[in-house]
């Protein structure tokens, strides 16, 4: 996170820290008990494009709450992972829920709509380009999508697309993404902070969901937007996945 | 009562027979586990005048049910009794209530308006003039009060009233009872029959209401109509001496 | 009015521990209701639960008990209604 | 979320009889709930009666038991919320 | 407001040339590609390309390419295309239309113009 | 070239009716789909597109749903100003192409 609040009170207890077997830092999403989602970018992280779940798990290594280590018993991938960028990952126990560790919710309406402010907490890197000692948040608006698309791809028209990322990466996007804005503060999610969730504060219901998971974490207030994966359109495929594990 | 229908599958549990000590059979109605309404005219029979409350309970026998005897504790006679002609009955124990053996509720508005028909029950003469075996019931019409007092009294004006009564006896006729009628069946209350209630069935609650006890027992089809004090104009009476006893 | 012969009185050496589940607790109350041909009096509910000092209380009327009182004007077997 | 520790669980020897009301019954009952950052998932509401065989039965699931989940969405303290 | 002027109704001979003028005001003139769009009558639509303004690059329906030149004079705010060796096919209404680079819709048509050839 | 289909050429309907005019593409076009409405007197406008999406100004009556191949166009309460032609255009794959159009008609 690049700017934005030091997290002092444990206000995102659904942020868990996942680190690679060469040690690099990246986000994950506790939504129950047992399972977390991630970004399939970061499940893949110093892993050929040819490893399997199964590889990967062993790999991996997992924080949840006060740097609590917890373990991982599967992975699974969304079966449309090059453009739905999310994996799933099942821990061996149950986490014990406490004021430190809280999963977030899943939406039953998409509240991603231009303007509405979300909070994305991570361990990503910071403006020393460090990863973060202390989990940090930034508020972000949900970008209008078509202004997103051009920013990055030139054109909303298939035929004129041409790759125009301002940081030499482009990021998936398609009909399962939305898209965040840097604040007017040039705060912004920055490397390592990818995984993390969008998180919207429903005011009536006094609740937290998961709006989207942040899976383009490389904009560092060069590019102008973050790209999330919309939760609503994976949210099938997770309630599926968990019953059948 | 004289026609009617015999009581074959106990629908008046709150009826009760009392015998006084030279062997009159008269009616009374329970109204609580341990409480019974009767008039004073029956507590007085074969009493002077001057016969206190604690002269008359010792010398009356009370069944419930099936001829369940009870014990009484003590009478109360009305403060009024010479116009408001009632008496309550507090017995020595409460009676268990079964499907024999029940109260009937005491109205909380009244019910007494012309042509509402009510259940009366009795233990008293019938067409041959003698006291019955069986509990008999008979369903009679409330009538028109003005009528009633034409029909005693010959007026509703007090200087043109004069016993008119065609049974030679003249009923107390005030703002406290309410007169019902003979049906066409020449069906009717007689001797005996005084202290049982006129039963109104709510159908909206599905419960049965003592509107009235029956005071003038002596129309037994010569005259149009018995006579019954209203237990709307004694229930705050009731619930007080209940209250203190 | 349900008799209460198909419920079994606790018998004197309690009741059944019921089963524990993960991350809960158990709360014990026993309903106060009354046999056939009586109704339940009270300005409570008629439920009682256990406190601290395993006395059996009500929330609105403490450790006071409600009543079994008569029904009144329900025969059984009512008279036939009125043609 | 309430925690469970203001109410004593049954000791082993199960609890203390309810005091016995003129022609009434005690139904004994039981509600589970769950600890702080836990929520009942039941289809029933969690109530439990003691049936004839002395088994505890909830009238809309039996003898199936609720489980306790975790409660989602509720941090204890949130972010201050967006000016 | 946005506008786009066409020229007026054209009868030309087969074999002829004919240029066709789309005029725009109301907007930043460069930022937007123009298209151009033919409707013969009593029939559907058919696309023949697009041009845009600010660096003049062009795309073609391969059913058109050689026979139709789209250019701009960004001095007048005007495009134009030239339809070549026409033949009695081509009579019909050529609607000239801007793309908002809304996944590819046109927003603002012109009002068309009639070539008659015969 | 993907083949626009609007397999309605005609359509009647009474003032107030739902009315639902469909488009089919010869392969999946993502959902870049636009509809367009010519009145009597040549003049187009742009009404949806991107499937669903209502152009601005665009009355809320008209609305657009569709993906794959099978797209459609609705419009909820029909007045009589809706009476003109009605075009579907794809635009995932050059050269864009157009349906036929559906004319549509009072009772």
């Known amino acids: 996170i690049l700017g934005g609040h030091l997290d002092a009170k444990g206000s995102f207890p659904w942020q868990a820290k996942m680190v690679s077997h060469h040690n690099l830092t990246t986000g994950a999403t506790l939504i129950n008990e047992q399972w977390l989602l991630t970004t399939a970018k970061n499940l893949f992280l110093n892993h050929s494009e040819n490893a399997t779940a199964k590889d990967i798990a062993p790999t991996l290594t997992l924080y949840v709450g006060k740097k609590q280590l917890v373990e991982i018993e599967k992975v699974v991938l969304h079966p449309n992972y090059s453009q739905v960028d999310i994996g799933l990952i099942k821990l061996k126990q149950k986490v014990s829920v406490n004021e430190r560790v809280m999963p977030i919710c899943l939406p039953s309406k998409d509240y991603a709509e231009v303007g509405r402010v979300g909070y994305v907490s991570g361990w990503g890197r910071n403006a020393n380009f460090k990863f973060t000692d202390h989990l940090k948040y930034v508020m972000l608006p949900v970008a209008d999508q078509d202004q997103c698309i051009r920013h990055y791809e030139g054109s909303t028209v298939p035929e004129k697309k041409t790759p125009k990322s301002p940081v030499g990466v482009q990021p998936i996007l398609n009909e399962h993404t939305f898209c965040a804005g840097m604040s007017k503060y040039q705060e912004d999610t920055c490397y390592g902070d990818a995984g993390s969730a969008f998180a919207v504060h429903d005011l009536e219901e006094d609740t937290w969901y998961a709006t989207g998971i942040l899976s383009f974490d490389k904009s560092c207030a060069v590019a102008e937007y973050g790209v999330y994966v919309k939760v609503t359109s994976i949210q099938d495929w997770v309630q599926k996945t968990i019953a059948e594990n | 009562i004289l026609g009617g229908h015999l009581d074959a599958k106990g629908s008046f549990p709150w009826q009760a027979k009392m015998v006084s000590h030279h062997n009159l059979t008269t009616g009374a109605t329970l109204i609580n586990e341990q409480w019974l309404l009767t008039t004073a005219k029956n507590l007085f029979l074969n009493h002077s005048e001057n016969a206190t409350a604690k002269d008359i309970a010792p010398t009356l026998t009370l069944y419930v049910g099936k001829k369940q005897l009870v014990e009484i504790e003590k009478v109360v006679l009305h403060p009024n009794y010479s116009q408001v002609d009632i008496g309550l009955i507090k017995l020595k124990q409460k009676v268990s209530v079964n499907e024999r053996v029940m109260p009937i509720c005491l109205p909380s508005k009244d019910y007494a308006e012309v042509g509402r028909v009510g259940y009366v029950s009795g233990w008293g003469r019938n067409a041959n003039f003698k006291f019955t075996d069986h509990l008999k019931y008979v369903m009679l019409p409330v009538a028109d009060q003005d009528q009633c007092i034409r029909h005693y009294e010959g007026s509703t004006v007090p200087e043109k009233k004069t016993p008119k009564s065609p049974v030679g006896v003249q009923p107390i006729l005030n703002e406290h009872t309410f007169c019902a009628g003979m049906s066409k069946y020449q069906e009717d209350t007689c001797y005996g029959d005084a202290g049982s209630a006129f039963a109104v069935h709510d159908l909206e609650e599905d419960t049965w209401y003592a509107t009235g006890i029956l005071s003038f027992d002596k129309s037994c089809a010569v005259a149009e109509y018995g006579v019954y004090v209203k237990v709307t104009s004694i229930q705050d009476w009731v619930q007080k001496t209940i209250a203190e006893n | 009015v349900d008799s209460g012969n198909d419920v079994t009185d606790i018998a004197d050496d309690g009741c059944p521990k019921p089963p524990e589940i993960a991350h809960g607790y158990v709360e014990h109350s026993v309903r106060y209701q009354c046999k056939n041909y009586y109704k339940l009096r009270t300005e409570g509910d008629g439920v009682y639960t256990l406190n601290n000092e395993k006395q059996w209380i009500n929330k609105a009327v403490g450790d006071k008990l409600p009543e079994c009182e008569a029904v009144c004007g329900k025969p059984k077997n009512p008279a036939n209604p009125v043609q | 979320v309430d925690s469970g520790n203001d109410v004593t669980d049954i000791a082993d020897d199960g609890c203390p009889k309810p005091p016995e009301i003129a022609h009434g019954y005690v139904e004994h009952s039981v509600r589970y709930q769950c600890k702080n950052y836990y929520k009942l998932r039941t289809e029933g509401d969690g109530v439990y009666t003691l049936n004839n065989e002395k088994q505890w039965i909830n009238k809309a699931v039996g003898d199936k038991l609720p489980e306790c989940e975790a409660v989602c969405g509720k941090p204890k303290n949130p972010a201050n919320p967006v000016q | 407001q946005v506008q786009l002027q066409q020229s007026g109704p054209e009868l030309v001979k087969p074999g002829a040339s004919v240029k066709l003028s789309c005029k725009a005001s109301?907007?930043?003139?460069?930022?937007?590609?123009i298209n151009w769009v033919k409707q013969r009558p009593g029939q559907g639509l058919e696309w023949i390309g697009w041009?845009?303004?600010?660096?003049?690059?062009?795309k073609y329906n391969a059913n058109f390419k050689g026979r139709a030149t789209l250019t701009v004079d960004t001095s007048s705010s005007t495009v134009y295309m030239e339809i070549h060796s026409l033949t009695s096919e081509d009579s019909a209404v050529y609607f000239c239309?801007?793309?908002?680079?809304?996944?590819?819709?046109?927003?603002?048509w012109g009002q068309g113009t009639t070539l008659t050839v015969s | 070239d993907i083949q626009m289909t609007q397999t309605t050429s005609s359509l009647s309907a009474s003032l107030g009716d739902r009315v639902t005019i469909s488009c089919r593409a010869s392969?999946?076009?993502?959902?870049?789909l636009n509809w367009y409405q010519q009145k009597p007197d040549g003049t187009v406008k742009l009404l949806i597109y991107?499937?669903?999406r209502l152009y601005s100004a665009v009355p809320s009556r008209f609305s657009g749903s569709g993906s794959g191949t099978d797209y459609s166009l609705t419009i909820s309460n029909l007045e009589q100003e809706d009476i003109a032609m009605y075009f579907c255009?794809?635009?995932?794959?050059?050269?864009?192409?157009f349906g036929g159009g559906t004319k549509l008609e009072i009772k």
């Open positions: 239309a801007r793309d908002p680079d809304y996944y590819g819709s046109v927003d603002y």
């Open positions: 109301g907007y930043t003139f460069i930022s937007y590609d």
């Open positions: 041009i845009y303004p600010r660096d003049g690059s062009t």
């Open positions: 392969q999946d076009i993502r959902k870049y």
């Open positions: 991107y499937t669903s």
């Open positions: 255009q794809q635009s995932d794959r050059l050269p864009y192409t």
